[in-house]
Interface confidence: medium
């Protein structure tokens, strides 16, 4: 979570909430009483912008959080990496059947980069996200935070960009990091032929044909 963020060379980042300077300013619905942007400090006293919600005592929760518009840069399939911490309902005092331990991830393709409102029916569900058994422990100053990491992919995409949304249905959760990226095959030289950076196809297994060129001082 902390320190410089170095990602594999074949991954191109479209959104990294940890790289945003200042407030993220994503859109929440309802405006109050649902997701809230909260700054926490890591062990190096660096602020981490997180979104959290913890309405575990109230029934029928439906709290939405939407990112800003994300350009797809020609990618047909994108990957969403979410780092989050989710409280175990059994660890909370007094909670009954209202407490949940999952949240939902959605996306909505759009050519409009300035949509102001969340229209729930426009969003397509990607998956229900639960806390995995495996987690990393992160020091956030005066206590250790259990950090789960989940990666989902979505595609094929066709519009200029898209929005991501997170739906809370009554969990005690903090989104600590959201990263969206696509994968590419990096520039490759084979047998004096050079093949450029190439974005992967719509499916994880699809082959993309790309025209190469001769390296300098060589001919076809």
């Amino acid at each position: 979570v902390t320190g410089s963020r170095v990602y594999p060379a074949n991954e191109v980042t479209l959104l990294d909430s940890r790289s945003v300077q200042g407030e993220l300013g994503w859109i929440a619905s309802p405006l109050e009483g649902g997701w809230e942007e909260v700054s926490i400090m890591d062990e190096k006293n660096t602020p981490i912008r997180t979104y959290q919600v913890c309405n575990v005592m109230e029934p029928s929760q439906n709290n939405w959080l939407r990112t800003d518009w994300i350009t797809r840069e020609g990618a047909q399939r994108v990957y969403i990496e979410i780092k989050f911490t989710l409280r175990d309902c059994n660890s909370l005092p007094g909670v009954m059947g209202t407490c949940k331990e999952t949240f939902n991830l959605y996306y909505y393709e759009s050519d409009n980069d300035k949509e102001r409102f969340i229209r729930e029916n426009q969003f397509v569900k990607i998956d229900t996200i639960a806390a995995d058994e495996s987690f990393t422990q992160v020091d956030i100053g005066d206590r250790i935070m259990k950090l789960n990491t989940e990666i989902r992919d979505v595609g094929p995409l066709s519009k200029k960009g898209f929005y991501l949304a997170f739906q809370d249905v009554g969990a005690c959760i903090a989104l600590v990091s959201v990263r969206v990226f696509y994968k590419k095959c990096p520039l490759t030289v084979r047998n004096l032929a050079q093949f450029p950076d190439t974005i992967t196809g719509a499916d994880t297994s699809s082959l993309v044909e790309v025209r190469g060129s001769c390296v300098n001082n060589s001919e076809e």
């Epitope: 109050e32 009483g33 926490i40 959290q52 913890c54 309405n55 575990v56 005592m57 109230e58 029934p59 929760q61 911490t85 409280r87 909370l92 005092p93 007094g94 009954m96 956030i140 206590r143 935070m145 005690c172 959760i173 903090a174």
Partner: antibody
Framework: QVQLKQSGPSLVQPSQSLSITCTVS????????VHWVRQSPGKGLEWLGV???????DYNAAFMSRLSITKDNSKSQVFFKMNSLQADDTAIYYC???????????????????WGQGTSVTVSS | DIQMTQSPSSLSASLGERVSLTCRAS??????LSWLQQKPDGTIKRLIY???TLDSGVPKRFSGSRSGSDYSLTISSLESEDFADYYC?????????FGAGTKLELK
């Protein structure tokens, strides 16, 4: 700073209802719930109920049939109403702010961190 | 309902003295306990939450601790403004329940 100011009658006739208003400042009712507690010489402190920040309520089963807690977020007011009062409902009634439960810190939902000044209510004819 | 048994019900002590009050929970409350102070005018103030965490602005002479199902509030050196009624509150489960209180008086 956080304040809870209560207003309501000091005398209620038997079988009548009690209405108390808790007007809050220094925090928003859309972010914090408000609890109600009473204190009587015979039974000590008793938790009556709570209205959560989303507007849903939870009541002590012993009072559920005659208790109603509502609020007006825009006016920062919480309304407490108890019906069919009898002499043993004579008590000091308090509203108290919920200490928000966090993802990282166990502040505890019910651990009321700020209290109103109390409304002393006598049930008598 | 969880019963909170508080002792002693009253306590006479002198200025500068160290005193301890105890609450015992009838069921497991996992440290979800607060200590409250009530002054003679009826004003209630929270001193401690989560069994041992001091509220901001509360003097360091107040401390909370836990030993199994027993929870204690200790005042290390009594000052004149500490003479009041003290209550424990469990917030582990519905309904929330309080101890019967301890009246701390000047000897």
């Amino acid at each position: 700073q956080v304040q809870l100011k209560q207003s309501g009658p000091s005398l209620v006739q038997p079988s009548q209802s009690l209405s108390i208003t808790c007007t809050v400042s220094g925090f928003s009712l859309t972010r914090y719930g408000v609890h109600w507690v009473r204190q009587s010489p015979g039974k000590g402190l008793e938790w009556l109920g709570v209205i959560w920040r989303g507007g849903s309520t939870d009541y002590n089963a012993a009072f559920m049939s005659r208790l109603s807690i509502t609020k007006d977020n825009s006016k920062s007011q919480v309304f407490f109403k108890m019906n069919s009062l009898q002499a043993d409902d004579t008590a000091i009634y308090y509203c108290a702010k919920e200490s928000l439960f966090g993802v990282y810190y166990d502040y505890g939902y019910y651990s009321m961190d700020y209290w109103g000044q109390g409304t002393s209510v006598t049930v008598s004819s | 309902d969880i019963q909170m048994t508080q002792s002693p019900s009253s306590l006479s002590a002198s200025l500068g003295e160290r005193v301890s009050l105890t609450c015992r929970a009838s069921q497991e409350i996992s440290g979800y306990l607060s200590w409250l102070q009530q002054k003679p005018d009826g004003t209630i103030k929270r001193l401690i939450y989560a069994a041992s965490t001091l509220d901001s602005g509360v003097p360091k002479r107040f401390s909370g601790s836990r030993s199994g199902s027993d929870y204690s509030l200790t005042i290390s050196s009594l000052e004149s403004e500490d003479f009041a009624d003290y209550y424990c509150l469990q917030y582990a489960s519905y309904p929330l329940t309080f101890g019967a209180g301890t009246k701390l008086e000047l000897k």
